[in-house]
């Protein structure tokens, strides 16, 4: 029978670490991490790490009992957890019978938004207590709410990941810019900022009709040439405060009728929000 892995939590040092080993298996040949989605009961879904590793193809694989994987996450708080994956059989060959290196994976470490993870793995038995053993590590940075997978998470939806304000902005005259956008029931307060290398105008927008989507309009006084300037719309939602997803548009000349026309180049930008 071919070896498989059985993984379980192991927070402390492995018991083998306390023992003296004359020989130890070699290091891992490769370690990779990618996010995968799994459905959860609440109708939301969770993002987990798929950690996969490749074993070195030589006879030292015969000593291999387990591989330990530890993950440290750094965002606004630090997390640390480890799993030990035991091999169910001794290795009878250095490569898979069908060809290629022995490759295994573990899916289970949860992934939070905008977090840097340090994933380390080493084979067991590992080096003796005062020796450096062979190990391998990789970094993985989880994406934020603008990611095509993450944006559908409830946390992100509440932060406006699916909201498209459809910003239009036009220069009415040398002193003013008219900004129009679609509001969202997620919040009722917004800030519109006009930038042309520096901030040339801004305005707070308060939209009392929070429960339905409406088209808001605001005329903003500017202190410089506004044509081609960037409009940045920052919403203030309860879940993310002043660090919600920001949206951008570009100021064009207003048509003669005074009605601003829609833009093609609306862009979104996360405001550095760490949920």
């Amino acid at each position: 029978r071919e070896p498989t892995v059985q993984c379980g939590s192991e927070t402390g040092p492995s018991p083998e670490w306390m023992l003296q080993h004359d020989l130890i298996p070699g290091d891992l040949r490769d370690l990779r991490v990618e996010p995968v989605t799994t459905s959860v009961a609440t109708g939301d879904y969770s993002i987990l790490m798929n950690v996969s590793w490749v074993l070195r193809a030589d006879a030292s694989i015969r000593l291999l009992k387990a591989t330990k994987i530890c993950v440290t996450g750094k965002s606004n708080f630090q997390s640390y957890s480890c799993v030990r994956c035991n091999y169910t059989e001794a290795f009878q060959t250095q490569t898979r019978p069908s060809g290629g290196k022995w490759t295994f994976s573990y899916i289970g470490f949860p992934v939070e938004l905008n977090t840097v993870y340090f994933i380390g793995a080493h084979n067991i038995p590992n080096a003796n207590m005062n020796e450096d053993g062979p190990s391998m590590s990789v970094n993985f940075t989880s994406p934020g709410c603008l990611d095509h997978i993450m944006k559908y998470k409830k946390k992100c939806v509440k932060a406006g990941s699916l909201w498209d304000p459809n910003i239009t902005a036009c220069k009415k005259n040398e002193e003013t810019v008219e900004v129009n956008f679609t509001t969202t029931p997620l919040g009722n307060r917004y800030m519109a900022l006009i930038q042309h290398s520096t901030i040339i105008g801004f305005s707070q927008v308060f939209e009392p009709h929070q429960k339905k989507q409406t088209r808001a309009s605001v005329v903003i006084p500017v202190t410089g040439d506004s044509e081609g300037a960037t409009v940045q719309l920052t919403p203030y939602f309860p879940t993310c405060g002043s660090d919600c997803i920001r949206h951008k548009g570009t100021v064009v000349l207003c048509p003669q009728t005074g009605v601003p026309f829609p833009l093609d180049n609306n862009k979104s930008k996360p405001g550095g929000w760490l949920p």
Epitope: Q94, G99, G100
Partner: antibody, heavy 118, light 107 residues
Framework: EVQLVQSGAEVKKPGASVKVSCKTS????????MNWVRQAPGQGLEWIGR????????QYNQKFKDKAILTVDTSISTAYMELSRLRSDDTAVYYC???????????WGQGTLVTVSS | DIQMTQSPASLSVSVGETVTITCRAS??????LAWYQQKKGKSPQLLVY???NLADGVPSRFSGSGSGTQYSLKINSLQSEDFGSYYC?????????FGGGTNLEIK
């Protein structure tokens, strides 16, 4: 029946290169590492390196790192070893040898004599 | 790199005798050892792998033993076809190395 058939003897001048082939049959080529071993006249055996035909991972004996290049063509189940900047002390019989479950050499080619002479 | 020291370098014996060839590794190779026989002008042939396992078609008069750093190959009741060179090889971790060889000749 597992067979490893190597290309014929070669005579080369110093500084030249030579490419030795090892055509395999009778087993799944990508399932076993292929090793190359050298035996100078009247001398013992020296491991040159090995290649995994599955993904072309190569491991060399440091001594031969700048001398030998190992490649495979999985479409024709053939391994190759190219020797460059030949010198007279590269004169030897070169063998391909297929690994077993681990790196004991279960099957050997018939050997290719490479003679380097001016 | 692991050095393999083989002894004796040559041996002159008669048919029917028993011989033992030894191989010492410079460090523990955890029983990852093979023995080969090579006849003049021919390719080496696997005799024994994993210290004690005989390769297909190898007569039972050949036997291997040892562990750690010390290994040996024993040939009982030598036959005429057993004469030639014998090599040990470790396959613990690359780079793999062979012993210097033992030349077995007829007395």
């Amino acid at each position: 029946e597992v067979q490893l058939v190597q290309s014929g003897a070669e005579v080369k001048k110093p500084g030249a290169s030579v490419k030795v082939s090892c055509k395999t049959s009778g087993y799944t080529f990508i399932s076993y590492w292929m090793n190359w071993v050298r035996q100078a006249p009247g001398q013992g055996l020296e491991w040159i390196g090995r290649i995994d035909p599955y993904d072309s991972e190569i491991q060399y004996n440091q001594k031969f790192k700048d001398k030998a290049i190992l490649t495979v063509d999985t479409s024709i189940s053939t391994a190759y070893m190219e020797l460059s900047r030949l010198r007279s002390d590269d004169t030897a019989v070169y063998y391909c040898a297929r690994s077993g479950g681990f790196d004991w050499f279960a099957y050997w080619g018939q050997g290719t004599l490479v003679t380097v002479s001016s | 790199d692991i050095q393999m020291t083989q002894s004796p370098a040559s041996l002159s014996v008669s048919v029917g005798e028993t011989v033992t060839i030894t191989c010492r590794a410079s460090e523990n190779i955890n029983s990852n050892l093979a023995w080969y026989q090579q006849k003049k002008g021919k390719s080496p042939q696997l005799l024994v792998y994993d210290v004690t396992n005989l390769a297909d078609g190898v007569p039972s008069r050949f036997s291997g033993s040892g562990s750690g750093t010390q290994y040996s190959l024993k040939i009982n009741s030598l036959q005429s076809e057993d004469f030639g060179s014998y090599y040990c090889q470790h396959f613990w971790r690359p780079p793999y190395t062979f012993g210097g060889g033992t030349n077995l000749e007829i007395k």
